[in-house]
């Protein structure tokens, strides 16, 4: 057992049929010594009385607020939760499997730029008697600071009968050094509760590697005269890092006929503009990838040929 | 560029730019392990990283870029070491198509770039870890060249940033 | 895209030789290696060497030395596999491949196999 | 050499099965193992790289693992279109070797 924070604990239970479970020792939080009761939750049943109460952990039932009462006020609450271990895996029941870039991926982290700010998000078919708490750092034994916000809900999706919930968070490493080359990487820990059950996800990765670029802005076509070819341009996103002499992009360019089937021709560019022949109801995409690193490549950004 | 000469900053950039390539090439990002899970982090702690205070920032390029030039020279000289290593010669056998081949060559070459002839700028003492098994020396290969990854990326940017902004 | 295409079968007699070649294209054919495999009727897959034709220089497994001899001819960017003394234990389909560009030897590309027949 | 002892040598299943195909490297070959599917009549189709790597194009049910001498290629849901032979390939050290095969056929 250990505790989260005031007053909420953690059981570690492992999850068998006919486990023991855990032996759990609360102690009432006063200077009282006599006349003290114990109750689990709303039941005004009493469990015991005396300054602490031993109890058995074997499941959910057993898990709760727990109140210490004298002369029928509440003395203190000691909240207990559950950590299940099956064949000696912690569970993961609150979060979906995102599968991307591999089995086992709970959390899904991306950064814009190499600022130090990532946004992390995961994603739960639970809708309700759900909280999420967020910590990170960089690097574990000798953490340096990173800042997370408040857990959003950033989306809600329908998926066949079932509706998923996308919740993400935003974070900012306090002393970020974009030029440098990280050699430690960024730890996330995820806590979620889920009525009385407690779950820890975590991810660990390095900005470099999670790095995935806005869509390139204000892509233009310009007819070239007396000619099927038109010159297209395009610029870096906003929120790519400066200067863009030291952080500088590659570009993807393609063609995309009305038809999805027809054949694409991908060109691959330092330049911020190219030559292409761009017919009638066809689409010019581009897109953008970090130029030394092979990270993410961003989504396109798309203009109609005509 | 001992003794506070320019490099040839464009001849350096393209250089840097095919190391990228190169490296990418060598070990490319697939899914059958994730490097930090396993041991031996000891070899890889040892290589030089650019660090925020190397002055390889575009604000510490223009005020001197020697800092820098100075720790990417120690870096190419250490991977390259590390490149013609048993590591890398002995089993899991590599063909001799191997990008390694080329990128051990291409480090070689930056790094002469960088110290012409004559000039000997001091070098830190390059590990010699000859792991026996086949699985800790791929391990290790894998390693190395996520490492280099990461270095020479910050080596063609700062390359790219001098050749468009400090050169004469 | 990347094609390796070999020649069509043959049927040979016992100690006679056979040359088998693999034409590549779609790749800058002295970029990579190329390997050459075999598989007797109703068999399993042998290793039997391979040719970097940028420097020419072929390398055997040790029980196809003075059996095999591989080359490759960079104009026409077409590689040959020399199969000497054939018996009829070397009846077999035999293939070209080309690996990944990461430098290992697994095989991605592969051309449509050659079937030899030693038989009197 | 490396041996790479492969079993079963054939294996009748059922659609919709998981199938499980084992190979044994005579010595330490870290992950260097491939897997082929090989069809009748066809050429060797590479299905999986360093043990666990899934190639460009595999269908998701194929799955590589193992590490040093112990290999497993399984498919989770057996398709009719999986009926072919299976080959294990170790490229860790020359020559390079592979497994006698597994035929899989449907039940």
């Known amino acids: 057992i250990w505790e989260l924070k005031k007053d909420v604990y953690v059981v570690e239970l492992d999850w068998y049929p006919d486990a023991p479970g855990e032996m759990v020792v609360l102690t009432c939080d006063t200077p009282e010594e006599d006349g003290i009761t114990w109750t689990l939750d709303q039941s005004g049943e009493v469990l015991g009385s005396g300054k602490t109460l031993t109890i058995q952990v074997k499941e959910f039932g057993d898990a709760g607020q727990y109140t210490c009462h004298k002369g029928g006020e509440a003395l203190s609450h000691s909240l207990l939760l559950l950590h299940k271990k099956e064949d000696g895996i912690w569970s993961t029941d609150v979060l979906k499997d995102q599968k991307e870039p591999k089995n086992k991926t709970f959390l899904r982290c991306e950064a814009k730029n190499y600022s130090g700010r990532f946004t992390c998000w995961w994603l739960t078919t639970i809708s309700t008697d759900l909280t999420f708490s967020v910590k990170s750092s960089r690097g574990s034994s000798n953490p340096q600071g990173v800042t997370c916000g408040a857990v959003t809900l950033s989306a809600e999706r329908v998926r066949g009968d079932n509706k998923e919930y996308e919740y993400s968070v935003e974070c900012q490493e306090d002393s970020a050094c974009p030029a440098a080359e990280e050699r430690l990487p960024i730890e996330v820990m995820v806590d979620a509760i889920h009525k009385l059950k407690y779950e820890n996800y975590t991810s660990s990765f390095f900005i470099r590697d999670i790095i995935k670029p806005d869509p390139p802005k204000n892509l233009q076509l310009k007819p070239l005269k007396n000619s099927r070819q038109v010159e297209v341009s395009w610029e870096y996103p906003d929120t790519w890092s400066t200067p863009h002499s030291y952080f500088s992009l590659t570009f993807c360019i393609q063609v995309q006929g009305k038809s999805k089937r027809e054949k694409k021709d991908r060109i691959f560019t330092d330049k911020t503009s190219a030559t292409v022949i761009c017919r009638k109801n066809a689409s010019f995409s581009v897109q953008a990838q970090d130029r030394y690193y092979s990270s993410s490549w961003s989504e396109w950004a798309s203009v109609p040929c005509s | 560029v001992p003794g506070g000469s320019s490099p040839a900053w464009a001849q350096c950039q393209q250089l840097s730019q095919k190391l990228c390539t190169l490296a990418w090439s060598a070990h490319p990002l697939v899914g059958h392990m994730d490097l930090r899970e396993e041991g031996d982090e000891e070899t890889t702690n040892d290589v030089p990283h650019i660090q925020c205070g190397d002055g390889c920032d575009p604000q510490g390029l223009r005020d001197n870029s020697q800092f820098c030039l100075q720790r990417i020279r120690q870096g190419l000289i250490f991977y390259e070491k590390l490149l013609g290593s048993d590591i890398f010669t002995g089993e899991p056998s590599l063909l001799p198509d191997s990008p390694v081949g080329q990128l051990h060559a291409s480090l070689l070459g930056l790094s002469q770039l960088l110290q012409p002839e004559g000039h000997h700028w001091e070098t830190q003492q390059i590990p010699s870890p000859s792991p026996s098994q086949p699985w800790q020396r791929l391990l290790l290969r894998f390693k190395i060249l996520r490492s280099l990854q990461a270095f020479v990326a910050v080596a063609a940017r700062v390359f790219a940033h001098g050749a468009a902004t400090l050169s004469p | 895209q990347v094609q390796l295409v070999q020649s069509g079968a043959e049927v040979k007699k016992p100690g006679s030789s056979v040359k088998v070649s693999c034409k590549a294209s779609?790749?800058?054919?002295?970029?990579?290696?190329i390997h050459w495999m075999r598989q007797a009727p109703g068999q399993g897959l042998e290793w039997i060497g391979y040719?970097?034709?940028?420097?020419?220089?072929?390398k055997y497994n040790e029980n196809f030395k003075g059996k095999v001899t591989i080359t490759a001819d960079k104009s026409t960017s077409t590689a040959y596999m020399e199969l000497s003394s054939l018996r009829s234990e070397d009846t077999a389909v035999y293939y070209c491949?080309?690996?990944?560009?990461?430098?290992?030897?697994?095989?991605?590309?592969w051309g449509q196999g050659t079937l030899v027949t030693v038989s009197s | 050499d490396i041996q790479m002892t492969q079993s079963p040598s054939s294996l009748s299943a059922s659609v919709g099965d998981r199938v499980t195909i084992t190979c044994k490297a005579s010595?330490?070959?870290?992950?260097?193992v491939a897997w082929y599917q090989q069809k009748p009549g066809k050429v060797p189709k590479l299905l999986i790289y360093?043990?666990?790597t899934r190639h460009t194009g595999v269908p998701s049910r194929f799955s590589g693992s193992g590490s040093r001498t112990d290999f497993t290629l399984t498919i989770s849901s057996l398709q009719p279109e999986d009926v072919a032979d299976y080959f294990c390939?170790?490229?860790?050290?020359?020559?390079?070797?592979f497994g006698s095969g597994t035929k899989l056929e449907i039940k």
């Open positions: 779609g790749y800058t054919f002295t970029d990579q290696t």
């Open positions: 040719i970097y034709p940028r420097d020419d220089s072929p």
């Open positions: 491949a080309i690996p990944d560009r990461s430098g290992y030897a697994w095989f991605i590309y």
């Open positions: 360093w043990a666990s």
């Open positions: 010595r330490d070959v870290a992950i260097a």
């Open positions: 390939h170790q490229y860790s050290s020359y020559p390079f070797t």
